[in-house]
């Protein structure tokens, strides 16, 4: 019960707290269990005790073993054990299971990943964060105090996250890394038959001949991450690329938005230099998911130019 597993990497700092707690005024003695040899308290040593903390600055593979801490008060002694394992640094990117801290789960609303054990160290911001060994870049990632915040969490954000920081001890700097898995859970997500918000069914859109026109197909599919959600345009029942009119193009990619927590998509159809024959076509906005397909049809009509005669 009063034994704790701790691990670290060679040439990094490792700080271990005694599993038995006591008041700050209580003295704590540390011993290397195998030899019963006392751990020094002088900071000039690479491995030294500092109250409830045992510090390896830096750690070496040979430091692995069981350390005993005894919390001494005027009326009692409490004994704890720290099982320390120091591993060689991996040459490849994979972080083995034995170096992983507890897995944390996140969702669209709560996506904090705390850097494990960081509270034991004397560190200064900012933390560096990596996912599967790649430095995290982009506005979706924000290093905040001792944790990482991910905006608009998606299932693709699941993976192994490593925090890296510098521990300072009497002016000397030591690197520390810690890795934990992050899983993404759907927060009360659901899926519904697609609802097309625009265009309205059988809408007539006024356009000017010779000008450009945009049609937006916008639909919502439910709440949270959706396995399948797609919005598409058809011309006379044919996909845009097969229709063979270069003036009419579907915007690449679908813009995703979350309004009121709903997962919505929109796709823009761009018609350049509107011609008379475009008024004869049927434009179908399609919304597709695992429930099925919804279709809204739009037709174009000529916008009469405003009469400026007096």
């Amino acid at each position: 019960k009063f034994s704790k597993q701790s691990w670290g990497l060679e040439n990094e700092a490792l700080i271990v707290r005694c599993p038995r707690q006591g008041k700050p005024s209580y003295t704590v003695d540390w011993y290397y269990s195998q030899t019963n040899k006392s751990i020094p308290t002088q900071e000039r040593n690479r491995v030294f005790a500092s109250g409830q903390l045992l510090k390896f600055l830096p750690a070496a593979v040979a430091d692995s073993g069981i350390y005993t801490c005894i919390v001494r008060s005027p009326t009692f002694n409490r004994t704890g054990y720290a099982n320390v394992t120091i591993y060689k640094k991996q040459s490849d990117c994979n972080v083995p299971d034995y170096l992983m801290y507890s897995t944390v789960s996140g969702s669209e609303k709560n996506s904090k990943i705390y850097c494990p054990t960081i509270d034991l160290y004397n560190w200064t911001a900012p933390l560096e964060w990596f996912k599967n060994c790649q430095a995290l870049q982009g506005s979706r990632y924000r290093a905040h105090k001792s944790f990482l915040v991910i905006d608009n969490v998606m299932t693709e954000d699941a993976g192994d996250y490593t925090c890296k920081f510098i521990h300072n001890e009497n002016g000397a700097n030591y690197s520390v890394t810690a890795t934990r898995s992050f899983t993404v859970k759907d927060e009360q997500g659901f899926s519904l038959f697609p609802v097309i918000g625009a265009p309205a069914q059988n809408e007539i859109k006024e356009v000017e001949i010779g000008k450009n026109a945009n049609l937006t197909c916008s639909a919502c599919f439910g709440k949270g991450t959706q396995f399948l959600a797609a919005v598409l345009w058809q011309l006379n029942g044919t996909k845009i690329t097969d229709f063979g009119e270069p003036r009419i193009q579907q915007e690449e990619g679908q813009n995703q938005s979350f309004s009121n927590g709903l997962a919505c998509l929109d796709m823009v159809l761009r018609i350049a230099d509107v011609k008379e024959e475009d008024l004869l076509l049927q434009y179908d906005c399609l919304a597709l998911n695992l429930h099925g397909l919804r279709r809204h049809t739009v037709r174009l009509s000529r916008k009469n130019p405003i009469d400026h005669h007096s």
Partner: nanobody, 121 residues
Framework: EVQLVESGGGLVQPGGSLRLSCAAS????????MGWFRQAPGKEREWMGV???????YYADSVKGRFTISADNSKNTAYLQMNSLKPEDTAVYYC???????????????WGQGTLVTVSS
């Protein structure tokens, strides 16, 4: 309504591969998407993936990287290429399609009779 006929199922060893085919006929005018789902005995229906008429594909996390969906529009046929099969992939695999006539404002998926895939040594 679209009629769908699956083929290509059978017995395969763990780690092996299999390619399922799905031929569509009937109201295939304006067919918008075809997909695959599976159902193991006593379990819920589980979608594997979908290919939309513009060629975009969507996969379940459980099969990403192992299963690939493709389609031959000229033959109105969809395919499911399954690699690195595991015993837990054993199930009846169904093909599904959605589309129908342009006058229909909302269509649910149609699906076939299914083909059994058994992964066992």
């Amino acid at each position: 309504e679209v009629q769908l006929v699956e083929s290509g199922g059978g017995l395969v060893q763990p780690g092996g591969s299999l390619r399922l085919s799905c031929a569509a006929s009937g109201s295939i005018y304006s067919l918008v998407a075809m997909g695959w789902f599976r159902q193991a005995p006593g379990k819920e229906r589980e979608w594997m993936g979908v290919i939309a008429y513009d060629g975009s594909t969507y996969y379940a996390d459980s099969v990403k990287g192992r299963f690939t969906i493709s389609a031959d529009n000229s033959k109105n046929t969809a395919y499911l290429q399954m690699n690195s099969l595991k015993p837990e992939d054993t199930a009846v695999y169904y093909c599904a399609a959605v589309g129908g006539a342009t006058t229909v404002t909302a269509s649910e998926w149609d699906w076939g009779q299914g083909t059994l895939v058994t992964v066992s040594s």
